[in-house]
């Protein structure tokens, strides 16, 4: 019996077509993605073959404008469309709190949505009862499938899940809700959820029972043969796991924002057992046509997204340098403001020993694209922010050594002067360097912001010690030549959008004032 | 033709008796003031005496908890329930901004609210047209008596009046429409106002016309002979002027708070020119008994206070560091939230030229009475405020030269690691000390934020600039030994109460996480 | 949270009939498709009759076919079992199911069912 896995994950509402980078989409002949090109494929697969499933490993929510103004309600409404037959929760699920997923997604979505390691407690426990699932029996042909969902258990340090949802541990509840499945004579389970490419491949050997893994989080790119654009893949597809007792097990991811439409084909014998498995990410390009209903109705919600990106989301009294000649050179307030809000945007529920789980922010200068002019009567638009902001990256947690952030503060002024974007804007820290020593030797003094202490003060970086950090996704990947972050982090989780975070720090804030106060100073 | 005429200002929502230093009254015994005791004294000597004014001077709004939640409703209720017959605007009237006077106040009021040099512009002319008047004719047995109001042209710097509303010169404004009450042959004319001492006896010199000046904002205290309480008198009761065209004009005002009534006979001539004019402010102490059934309406009013003050503002994720072991030998959070606090609540318009017209705090350490501990589920009350600040004092503007505050940052260590109360936390200042050199010789540096920029940044103190600076009233009375504020400054103006700036601080942030940065260091 | 309540069940004689209800709330109704399960002392729970979400497909046991109906007021978010004919072996604990997904045809497996509600008693008496 053969079954066809159609999957997405990370898509973070990247709901229109982008450019190959997943950016904003400038030139329409060569866009890619989007969900009128996405349905274009799935009914093309649907016409062609018996038995597809539709499933999505989470991470829907956040990334552009139409999760900030549609707040959720796009996902469902655009998923429903596409038929989706399961869905993940991812944790970009909460970044809205427990309410902004119930409300616009829970109630609305005609699949099921499912997490078998996320339990609630207190008064909410009633409350989201029986709105998402720990799994779910889809009939599919003759057959039925079973779906276990499972989200990061790190969901509480990277969203805004509220103190009533706890996040067990995957692979522990996991197995008895697949082990119920089994005595349910559910005999072919996928395992679908969103807690990263290392988690995945333990739930695929942990896990008895589970005969595929569809993942995400991670970004994964697999592929099997030449790759059709950028993306390097980090394996084969599917990545075969050998499991505790002795199966092959597929395990597979498919990038993220929508680009690819994962495509996994399995044969199973009568008693479920996955005899082969085979395919491939399909690249979503403009070879493939955006289906005109769809496309019709992603213009008509589009309507909003124009009006909304010029209205006053709050005020600056005054200039928000965000000039190359400030940012690469000096501490500037944008650099400041920025990294303030990146801080605002990581305030979690901690242990008591805690004040917050991260007090840290770095920014490469040359990301500032646009200051800010204040003699508009101060009003701050979306707009003027993704001028500032115009890459569409994400504001990410990484965890680093302290010997790795020295290098990288080394990194921000090894070659000081001619205007290049690694100069690093900061929060939490205070940097001193002295430029007549030689590069690599720069930095005289690295105070960092402590995090296990009840009043925050600044103490000197610890080389062995481990750091969290926000920065934007494209430090964490080495970009601007931050190959010593790229290689020596030890963890990383991505983050929300970056104009999303400012916005809503300007918008919480009402009227900002930052100033240039002494985070980098040169001795 | 005798006139009495009775006058309070500055009032600040003293609508309970207080203690003698008009704080929260402890031991009731020996409390004073408060609308129900000054009732009592007013119908007394309205019975007593044919012609009797009751004219409030402004600055009834922001003092206390009353304020806080009636929000001037307070103030039109029980100035409405004591008859007075005219209040003039202050500056404080304006700190919920226009619609914050508009509704509760001068559509409540029962009586005349008076100002001749604000002028509406724009779309508020229309809507205010009317709801205050420049003057008012009042009649009194068979005569009549103008009233004209003037408002302190400092008030678009000292409180929220915004854009379109113009304060003129008083001198200028009022001019026109005394000769207006000439044409109109009143012929015994009051200006009652808000401008301060040294504004008043500059109207009763330059204009023509005025007769008495009925005054407020600089919480003068005037006496004749011994005076019976704490507060020395500037000057006499009344204090004499001589205009420009020779004629004695009484200028009065009567301390603060509700402490005292001010008690003026005047005598005029057939054609209204003042013969002789005598009193002396009339302290309302407990030998005055409280007026029962106002006191019964204040006590009725009072239970939505003691709701109010246990209700949660905002949330610390932060302990904040109010102890004396921190704040008297060190920079402190506590100190930083407040004075953070302190800026945030004196933003206003200014001009193009400055980002803000003040950049600066400074606060005693020994005014930081209590710590707030963050492990009672992060809330922050009133009630909890109350305890970091107990004695119900005001944030004030004042403007001091360079070298004044350098004598005061000396002074501010002069006895360093004594626990003594003059140590300074701070805003928009970077200090350090050198605690090896003498007293009077250890600031060895003192950075402040710019104002004059359109990027704050910190730059050095010079000795010959004037510099505006917001600080508690205790160190502007040159409270812990701060002399040489009292005895320097070139201007001061009393500003909003010191719980209120902070609570509402917090309200708007919603979670505060104020760290120890680098402020105040030693070297 | 998503709730099923059935009503509508009692004492019938043979060749009577009953109209069950059953009523959902918590999730969009047209987002459910809509089952009857029946469970008599000592046997298996057993499928009656279902209703896709769109009431336009529907699905009922050999036992039933002809006598059995199940409509669906989406206004109301109610579904209905109408039993006409009814017989002894008809006697059992009825179960009112959802599953939540949009499927043309509802399905006859008890394992696809999501939510369930707690029974209503049916017997037929000779």
């Known amino acids: 019996w053969e079954l066809t896995i159609l999957h997405t994950n990370d898509v973070h509402s990247r709901l229109e077509q982008t450019s190959e980078d997943s950016s904003k989409c400038v030139n329409a002949s060569r866009c890619m993605g989007g969900v009128a090109r996405l349905f274009t494929k799935v009914q093309q697969i649907r016409r062609a073959e018996p038995n597809v499933l539709l499933l999505d490993a989470g991470d829907q929510y956040q990334g552009t404008i139409w999760f900030t103004v549609y707040k959720g309600a796009e996902v469902a409404h655009f998923m429903n469309a596409l038929r989706y037959d399961a869905m993940a929760l991812g944790n970009h699920e909460f970044d809205n709190g427990v309410e902004g997923l119930i409300e616009p997604l829970l109630k609305e979505a005609k699949f099921p949505i499912l997490s078998a390691n996320i339990k609630a407690k207190g008064p909410l426990a009633s409350q989201i009862s029986g709105l998402y699932l720990p799994y779910k029996v889809l009939p599919v042909g003759d057959e039925v499938v079973g779906i276990v969902g499972y989200t990061s258990k790190e969901t509480p340090f990277l969203s805004n899940p509220g103190t009533n949802l706890v996040f067990e541990d995957e692979i522990t509840a996991l197995q008895p809700e697949v082990d119920k499945l089994k005595t349910l004579n559910v005999n072919k389970i996928i395992a679908l959820g969103h807690s990263g490419f290392e988690t995945d491949k333990l739930i695929a050997q942990k896990v008895r029972g589970v005969d595929v893994v569809v993942g995400g989080h991670s970004n994964t790119f697999l592929y099997t043969g030449n790759p059709p654009s950028k993306e390097v893949p980090a394996g084969k597809y599917p990545f075969i796991v050998t499991s505790d007792d002795g199966r092959k097990v597929p395990v597979v991811q498919a990038y993220a924002f929508g680009k690819y439409l994962g495509y996994l084909k399995i044969e199973f014998d009568e008693r479920g057992n996955v005899i082969s498995s085979h395919g491939n990410p399909i690249l979503l390009n403009s070879s493939i046509p955006e289906d005109p209903s769809i496309k019709a109705d992603i213009n008509k919600w589009r309507i909003k997204l124009d009006n909304y990106s010029t209205q006053e989301l709050g005020k600056t009294i005054v200039y928000l340098d965000g000039s190359s000649q400030s940012c690469r050179f000096r501490e500037c307030n944008m650099g400041n403001l920025i990294c303030d809000a990146m801080i605002n945007n990581n305030l979690r529920h901690a242990d008591e020993m805690f004040w917050n789980h991260v007090s840290m922010c770095i920014l490469n200068g040359g990301g500032i694209r646009s200051p800010i002019d204040e003699r508009n009567n101060g009003t701050i638009t979306w707009e003027n922010l993704a001028a500032v902001l115009p890459f569409g990256g994400t504001f990410d947690l990484v965890q680093l050594k302290g010997s790795t952030l020295k290098k990288a503060f080394e990194h921000s002024v090894h070659r000081y002067g001619q205007s290049t974007g690694e100069f690093l804007q900061v929060g939490g820290i205070h940097v001193v360097y002295d430029l007549s020593r030689k590069p690599g030797d720069r930095v005289v003094k690295l105070d960092v912001l402590c995090t296990k202490c009840r009043v925050p003060s600044y103490d000197p970086l610890k080389m062995d010690e481990i750091y969290k950090v926000i920065l934007p996704n494209f430090l964490a990947n080495g970009g601007d030549g931050f190959q010593m972050i790229k290689d020596e982090l030890l963890r990383h989780d991505s983050g929300d959008q970056d104009i999303n975070v400012v916005s809503t720090y300007i918008s919480k804030m009402k009227v900002i004032y930052p100033a240039v106060e002494g985070r980098i100073k040169f001795s | 033709w005798e006139l009495t005429i009775l006058h309070t200002n500055d009032v600040h929502s003293r609508l309970e008796q207080t203690s003698e230093d008009s704080s929260k009254c402890v031991n009731a015994s020996r409390c004073m003031g408060g609308v129900a005791r000054l009732f009592t004294k007013v119908q007394q000597i309205r019975r007593a005496e044919p012609n009797v004014l009751l004219l409030d001077a402004g600055d009834q709004y922001q003092g206390t908890i009353w304020f806080t939640v009636y929000k001037g409703a307070e103030v039109a209720h029980f100035m409405n329930a004591l008859r007075y017959d005219a209040m003039a605007l202050g500056n404080h009237e304006f700190d919920n901004g226009v619609e914050g006077l508009i509704e509760p106040l001068l559509k409540e009021a029962k009586f005349p609210i008076l100002s001749a040099n604000i002028k509406a512009k724009g779309p508020l002319a229309s809507q205010i047209s009317g709801l205050y008047l420049p003057y008012k004719v009042l009649p009194v047995g068979d005569e009549v008596v103008g009233i004209v109001g003037y408002t302190s042209k400092e008030t678009p710097f000292l409180s929220n009046p915004g854009t379109n509303l113009v304060f003129e010169d008083e001198i200028t404004a009022l001019q026109p429409e005394v000769d207006k009450l000439k044409t109109l042959n009143v012929n015994k004319i009051i200006a009652l106002g808000h401008s301060g001492f040294e504004t008043d006896k500059l109207i009763a010199q330059k204009v023509r016309g005025v007769d008495v000046v009925v005054g407020g904002h600089s919480n003068t205290f005037l006496y004749t002979g011994n005076p019976p309480s704490k507060e020395v008198p500037a000057g006499k009761y009344p204090f004499i002027v001589t205009s420009d065209d020779g004629r004695k004009v009484p200028v009065v005002q009567a301390y603060a708070f509700g402490k005292y009534l001010g008690y003026l006979k005047i005598e005029f001539d057939e054609r209204g020119n003042v013969i002789s004019s005598h009193g002396n402010p009339i302290l309302l102490n407990s030998s005055i008994p409280e007026d029962p059934s106002i006191k019964a309406d204040i006590n009725k009013w009072r239970i939505k206070l003691d709701n109010y003050s246990t209700q949660e503002l905002g949330k610390t994720i932060v302990y904040l560091d109010g102890s004396s072991q921190s704040c008297r030998f060190r920079e402190c959070n506590m100190g930083n939230l407040i004075c953070d606090a302190m800026i945030n609540n004196n933003l206003r318009h200014a001009d193009e030229m400055f980002w803000n017209h003040v950049s600066m705090c400074i606060l005693n350490g020994g005014g930081i009475r209590s710590p707030i501990d963050e492990r009672n589920n992060g809330t922050i009350t009133w009630e909890n405020l109350a305890a970091v600040l107990p004695f119900g004092g005001t944030f004030d503007l004042v403007q001091l030269k360079g070298s004044t505050l350098k004598k005061a940052f000396e002074h501010s260590v002069h006895r360093y690691g004594q626990s003594t109360g003059e140590f300074l936390q701070v805003g928009g200042i970077h200090v350090v000390y050198d605690l090896s050199r003498k007293p009077g010789d250890r600031v060895v540096k003192l950075d402040v934020l710019c104002t004059k920029c359109r990027v704050p940044s910190y730059d050095p103190l010079k000795m010959d600039e004037i510099y505006k600076v917001i600080l508690p009233n205790f160190l502007a009375n040159g409270g812990d030994g701060f002399q040489m504020i009292k005895d320097e400054l070139l201007r001061h103006d009393s500003g909003d109460q010191d719980i209120n700036v902070v609570s509402t601080y917090i309200s708007k942030m919603k979670v505060i996480y104020p760290a120890v940065e680098g402020r105040i260091k030693f070297s | 949270e998503v709730q099923l309540v059935e009503s509508g069940g009692g004492v019938v004689q043979t060749g009577g009939s009953l109209r069950l209800s059953c009523a959902a709330s918590?999730?969009?109704?047209?987002?459910?498709?809509m089952g009857w399960f029946r469970q008599a002392p000592g046997k298996e729970r057993e499928f009656v009759a279902a209703?896709?979400?769109?009431?336009?497909?529907?699905q009922f046991a050999d036992s039933v076919k002809g006598r059995f109906t199940i409509s669906r007021d989406n206004a109301k978010n109610t579904v209905y079992l109408q039993m006409n004919s009814l017989k002894p072996e008809d006697t059992a604990v009825y179960y009112c199911?959802?599953?939540?997904?949009?499927?043309?045809?509802?399905?006859?497996?008890?394992?696809?069912?999501?939510?369930w509600g707690r029974g209503t008693q049916v017997t037929v008496s000779s």
């Open positions: 918590g999730r969009t109704f047209t987002h459910l498709a």
């Open positions: 209703i896709s979400n769109s009431g336009a497909g529907t």
């Open positions: 199911a959802a599953d939540w997904g949009t499927r043309d045809s509802p399905s006859k497996l008890n394992a696809v069912y999501d939510y």
